[in-house]
C-alpha cells in the first residue's frame, strides 16, 4: 500500500525538513530559512516561532522542529508550549491586576506563582494548630486537643537523620 501511495502521490516521499514544491514539478525542496516541517509529505513549511520581548529562545528552530521559548528571568511560563509569560512574585504574595500583593491574613503562598490559599482548618479534622501559619507557609496541624490532655505523652518531632560520617554537634 505504501508503495502504491508513493506512486500516486510523489509528495509522500518528501521527508521532514522539506516540502513538496508544486512550482517545481513536486520536487522535495528544503524548507526556506526561518521555517520548518516536522513531518514528511508536507506541501508547505511552517513559519518558525520567534521568541521576542518577554520570551527568549530555549531551543532554536531547525528545518524539522519549531523554536521553543521560555520566559525572561522574573517571569514563568503559562499555557501549552509557554504561550504566555507571567511575572513572578515573592513567596507570601500573589499576582493581581496591580502587581504583586501580600497574601491576606489567613492565606499563604509558598511559591513564586499562583494564588494565595487559605490556611488548613485543623479543627475540621479534629486536630489542633501545632505551628501557626504565615503568608509563606500553611499551618501545621498537630494531634487533637484531647490527645494533649495531662498525662498524655507530648508530641516530639523525630530527631533529624544524620549523614554518615558526621559526628553530632
Amino acid at each position: 500500500f505504501e508503495r502504491t501511495r508513493s506512486l500516486q502521490d510523489p509528495c509522500s516521499n518528501c521527508p521532514a525538513g522539506t516540502f513538496c514544491d508544486n512550482n517545481r514539478n513536486q520536487i522535495c525542496s528544503p524548507c526556506p530559512p526561518n521555517s520548518f516541517s516536522s513531518a514528511g509529505g508536507q506541501r508547505t513549511c511552517d513559519i518558525c516561532r520567534q521568541c521576542k520581548g518577554v520570551f527568549r529562545t530555549r531551543k532554536e528552530c531547525s528545518s524539522t522542529s519549531n523554536a521553543e521559548c521560555d520566559c525572561t528571568p522574573g517571569f514563568h511560563c503559562l499555557g501549552a508550549g509557554c504561550s504566555m509569560c507571567e511575572q513572578d512574585c515573592k513567596q507570601g504574595q500573589e499576582l493581581t491586576k496591580k502587581g504583586c500583593k501580600d497574601c491576606c491574613f489567613g492565606t499563604f503562598n509558598d511559591q513564586k506563582r499562583g494564588i494565595c490559599r487559605p490556611w488548613t482548618n485543623c479543627s475540621l479534622d479534629g486536630k489542633s494548630v501545632l505551628v501557626n501559619g504565615t503568608k509563606e507557609r500553611d499551618v501545621v496541624c498537630g494531634p487533637s486537643p484531647a490527645d494533649l490532655s495531662p498525662g498524655a505523652s507530648s508530641v516530639t518531632p523525630p530527631a533529624p537523620a544524620r549523614e554518615p560520617g558526621h559526628s553530632p554537634q
Epitope: 521576542k52 520581548g53 518577554v54 527568549r56 491586576k97
Partner: nanobody, 125 residues
Framework: QVQLQESGGGLVQPGGSLRLSCAAS????????MGWFRQAPGKGLEGVAV????????SYADSVKGRFTISRDNAKNTLYLQMNSLRAEDTAVYYC??????????????????WGQGTLVTVSS
C-alpha cells in the same frame, strides 16, 4: 509612587524622525519589561515595541519594524523610542508602560501595571 513621563512628541513631516523619551521614577526599572503603545484618533490601543531585561531581542509591531527602535538607559531610568521614516499613519498619542504582569506573543496581549500620560505625535505635511 510610580510615575512615567513621556516627552519628545510633536509635529513632523512625513519621512522625518522623532525620538520619544519616557522617564520612570519610583520604579525599579531594570528588573522588568517596558513598552511603547499608541492610540490613533478613533482607534484602539496598539502595541508598538517592548523591551525586557535579560530577554531576547525587543518585540516590534509589524507596522513599525525596521523604522522604530526601542532602547533604554538603566542609569537614567529612561526608555526611548527612535522613530524614523515617519508616515501619516504613525500619528497617535504614544504611551510608555512599565511593570509587565503577563503577556502572550502578540504585543496587544501585554498587560502592564503602570502607564504614562502620553505624548502626541503628528505626522503631516
Amino acid at each position: 509612587q510610580v510615575q512615567l513621563q513621556e516627552s519628545g512628541g510633536g509635529l513632523v513631516q512625513p519621512g522625518g524622525s522623532l525620538r520619544l523619551s519616557c522617564a520612570a521614577s519610583g520604579y525599579t526599572y531594570s528588573s522588568n519589561c517596558m513598552g511603547w503603545f499608541r492610540q490613533a484618533p478613533g482607534k484602539g490601543l496598539e502595541g508598538v515595541a517592548v523591551i525586557c531585561t535579560g530577554g531576547g531581542s525587543p518585540s516590534y509591531a509589524d507596522s513599525v519594524k525596521g523604522r522604530f527602535t526601542i532602547s533604554r538607559d538603566n542609569a537614567k531610568n529612561t526608555l526611548y523610542l527612535q522613530m524614523n521614516s515617519l508616515r501619516a499613519e504613525d500619528t497617535a498619542v504614544y504611551y510608555c508602560a512599565a511593570d509587565l504582569l503577563r503577556a502572550g506573543t502578540p504585543l496587544s496581549s501585554y498587560e502592564f501595571n503602570y502607564w504614562g500620560q502620553g505624548t502626541l505625535v503628528t505626522v503631516s505635511s
